[in-house]
Interface confidence: low
């Protein structure tokens, strides 16, 4: 239904707190360099304006679109060109081009310092003094570093943050209460960020149809008792919600997501028997809970997939009459039978089925041609299954840090031209798949591993797009989203790469490394490992292990020495010499 004032409508639907939080996220994601105070001022102005529109929808400018209102606000910021360069050119355009321009200038890797968590006591003090401002800072800092973070989910994580602080700040030992809990929220939020970025990439590069296919597969796995019409309705609504969030329409997105949660809770009988617990929760928790609800029990009497999609004499007729519906039904039927497959794999199978019908339905004897299609799925299914087994075995043998190092070597060999920080970040993230997925029951490993890897590799592609340096990476990132992971897995050592010359300073360390937190130490060591591989791309695993063990021993010795500086300056050059010899 049309509203005289869109901003009044959203303010009323969302309530002041959500409205302000979402506007703050939107501004922080568009203008990533502005301070919290600058954004907070804009948010207050927008909120005050929204309130005037609530009081009188026909007041001046209340009928303007949200893009116009928000864009005008952003374009009125002083020193926009000095701080944001060519982004200021967006302000010369009219809507909807202006918003598109803003979206194109979102930076997936902004040059902002890492978000450092304050010390527990200081955090609790500022939280108690003004919880609203404290939460505002959290939303601002996360949103500007993750310009595609799913806004209603970010409100949920802020809620988690708030609850943890409320609980832990009342404890005697605040630090030991806060640290593990906030680490947990941070880990989940980072995974949420890369997953959502993948959804936005799918939408941006391949359109709504591609996202809807993803949604049909995912929803069919989760709700195998829902019929195809129900799944299609949910997929359509979910596509709209994600399109809005990816497009910067955060108020509409949050509002529609709340509507979708409401619909699901009102229609549990036709969707799933597992929703009640989620539906008993307040809004933000409810929507989050529904997004990761456990799979419903599969119906016991599902017929074999072949009946309708291989053996039926009308296959080509049904396909020709309504291609999208027929393929959608295939994806639905296959997915509801396979909660143990990744969405990426299910989409590859649907693509294979589509290609087979395109080819076979044009032939003289279609049934003879497409009759073996299900058997042809076998290699497509075996490949990711083998990937999971191999990698989980390696993870169990090496542990997370060792597994990250193995991946770092592998990916540096595949794409040695990529910058070392990007390779280290990617390897560390890819390596976390072990901890995240390999401990799960067998039937949950494949979907966990492959869909997580796909999301991480999407980030690799986005960073590489900014400064393309590797033909290997360009090749894998140019193809379809679902083929990326198999493409990266299949890459071997880049034979075109000319090894970097050995620079002693790359492997020279100082005593300040001793006081770094464990994570930072690991990053330093992994940076050295990537540089070693760039110097010797064909070094054996044994050679690299020797060097890294020597390096670890050197750090251990010098960090325990009475005179650390002397130890580093005398033992360091010896280490460099030994490294060169070991890799000769």
């Amino acid at each position: 239904e049309a509203h005289k004032s869109e901003i009044a409508h959203r303010y009323n639907d969302l309530g002041e707190q959500h409205f302000k939080g979402l506007v703050l996220i939107a501004f922080s994601q568009y203008l990533q360099k502005c301070s919290y105070d600058e954004h907070a001022k804009l948010v207050q102005e927008v909120t005050d304006f929204a309130k005037t529109c609530v009081a009188d929808e026909s007041a001046a400018n209340c009928d303007k679109s949200l893009h116009t209102l928000f864009g005008d606000k952003l374009c009125a910021i002083p020193n926009l060109r000095e701080n944001y360069g060519e982004l200021a050119d967006c302000c010369t355009k009219q809507e909807p081009e202006r918003n598109e321009c803003f979206l194109q200038h979102k930076d997936d890797n902004p040059s902002l310092p890492p978000f450092e968590r304050p010390e527990a006591e200081a955090m609790c003090t500022s939280f108690k003094e003004n919880p609203t401002t404290f939460m505002g800072h959290y939303l601002h800092e996360v949103a500007r570093r993750h310009p595609y973070f799913y806004a209603p989910e970010l409100l949920y994580y802020a809620e988690q943050y708030n609850e943890i602080l409320t609980q832990c700040c009342a404890e005697a030992d605040k630090e030991s209460c806060l640290t593990p809990k906030l680490d947990g929220v941070k880990e989940k939020a980072l995974v949420s960020s890369v997953r959502q970025r993948m959804k936005c990439s799918s939408m941006q590069k391949f359109g709504e149809r591609a996202f809807k296919a993803w949604a049909v597969a995912r929803l069919s796995q989760t709700f195998p008792n829902a019929d195809f019409a129900e799944i299609t309705k949910l997929a359509t609504d979910l596509t709209k919600v994600n399109k809005e969030c990816c497009h910067g329409d955060l108020l509409e997105c949050a509002d529609d997501r709340a509507e979708l949660a409401k619909y699901m809770c009102e229609n549990q009988a036709t969707i799933s028997s597992k929703l009640q617990t989620c539906c008993d929760k307040p809004l933000l928790k409810k929507a989050h809970c529904l997004s990761e609800v456990e799979h419903d029990t599969m119906p016991a009497d599902l017929p074999a997939i072949a009946a309708d999609f291989v053996e039926d004499q009308e296959v080509c007729k049904n396909y020709a009459e309504a291609k999208d519906v027929f393929l959608g039904t295939f994806l639905y039927e296959y997915s509801r039978r396979h909660p143990d497959y990744s969405v990426s794999l299910l989409l590859r199978l649907a693509k294979k089925y589509e290609a087979t019908l395109e080819k076979c339905c044009a032939e003289a004897n279609p049934p003879a041609c497409y009759g073996t299609v299900l058997a042809e799925f076998q290699p497509l299914v075996e490949e990711p299954k083998n990937l999971v087994k191999t990698n989980c075995d390696l993870y169990e043998k090496l542990g997370e840090y060792g597994f990250q190092n193995a991946i770092l070597v592998r990916y540096t060999q595949k794409a040695p031209q990529v910058s070392t920080p990007t390779l280290v970040e990617a390897a560390r993230n890819l390596g976390r798949v072990g901890t995240k997925c390999c401990t799960l029951p067998e039937d949950q490993r494949l979907p966990c591993v492959e869909d997580y890897l796909s999301a991480i590799l999407n980030r690799v592609c986005l960073l590489h797009e900014k400064t393309p340096v590797s033909e290997h990476v360009t090749k894998c990132c140019s193809g379809s989203l679902v083929e990326r992971r198999p493409c990266f897995s299949a890459l071997t050592v880049d034979e075109t790469y000319v090894p970097k010359e050995f620079k002693a300073e790359t492997f020279t360390f100082h005593s300040d490394i001793c006081t770094l937190p464990e994570k930072e130490k690991q990053i330093k060591k992994q940076t050295a490992l990537a540089e070693l591989v760039k110097h010797k791309p064909k070094a054996t695993a044994e050679q690299l292990k020797t060097v890294m063990d020597d390096f670890a021993q050197f750090l251990d010795t010098c960090c325990k020495a009475a005179d650390k500086d002397t130890c580093f300056s005398t033992e360091g050059p010896n280490l460099v010499t030994r490294c060169k010899d070991a890799l000769a």
Epitope: G15, Q17, H18, G21, V54, A55, P131, A158, N162, P282
Partner: nanobody, 116 residues
Framework: EVQLVESGGGLVQPGGSLRLSCAAS????????LAWYRQAPGKQRDLVAR???????YYADSVKGRFTISRDNSKNTLYLQMNSLRAEDTAVYYC??????????WGQGTLVTVSS
């Protein structure tokens, strides 16, 4: 969390009026929607009226034109002005707060009896 305390209930004759109040305390900054629900003996709890932080209101059909919901943000108080009361309005009236950062909160309820 948000704590809610209702007051103003009591016995009233058909056609009479009552004003219910609900005082909110705790993390009141996080409240976005306030509402009144009621539960008659042996029945489920039903929404009577709600008001968003933007001031927009909603009323159940059975009370439209007779009841008015309002809020005073400076006092963190919600009100329900009930006019032309009928026997079927007899129920325990509950104050409800939906919050951005916390689970929803309910008051303990105040009894309204309409009888001659």
């Amino acid at each position: 969390e948000v704590q809610l305390v209702e007051s103003g209930g009591g016995l009233v004759q058909p056609g009479g009026s009552l004003r219910l109040s609900c005082a909110a305390s705790g993390s009141t900054w996080s409240i976005n929607t306030l509402a009144w629900y009621r539960q008659a003996p042996g029945k489920q709890r039903d929404l009577v009226a709600r008001i968003s932080s933007g001031g927009s209101t909603y009323y159940a059909d059975s009370v439209k034109g007779r009841f008015t919901i309002s809020r005073d943000n400076s006092k963190n108080t919600l009100y329900l002005q009930m006019n032309s009361l009928r026997a079927e309005d007899t129920a325990v009236y509950y104050c409800y707060a939906q919050s951005t950062w916390y689970p929803p909160s309910w008051g303990q309820g105040t009894l309204v009896t309409v009888s001659s």
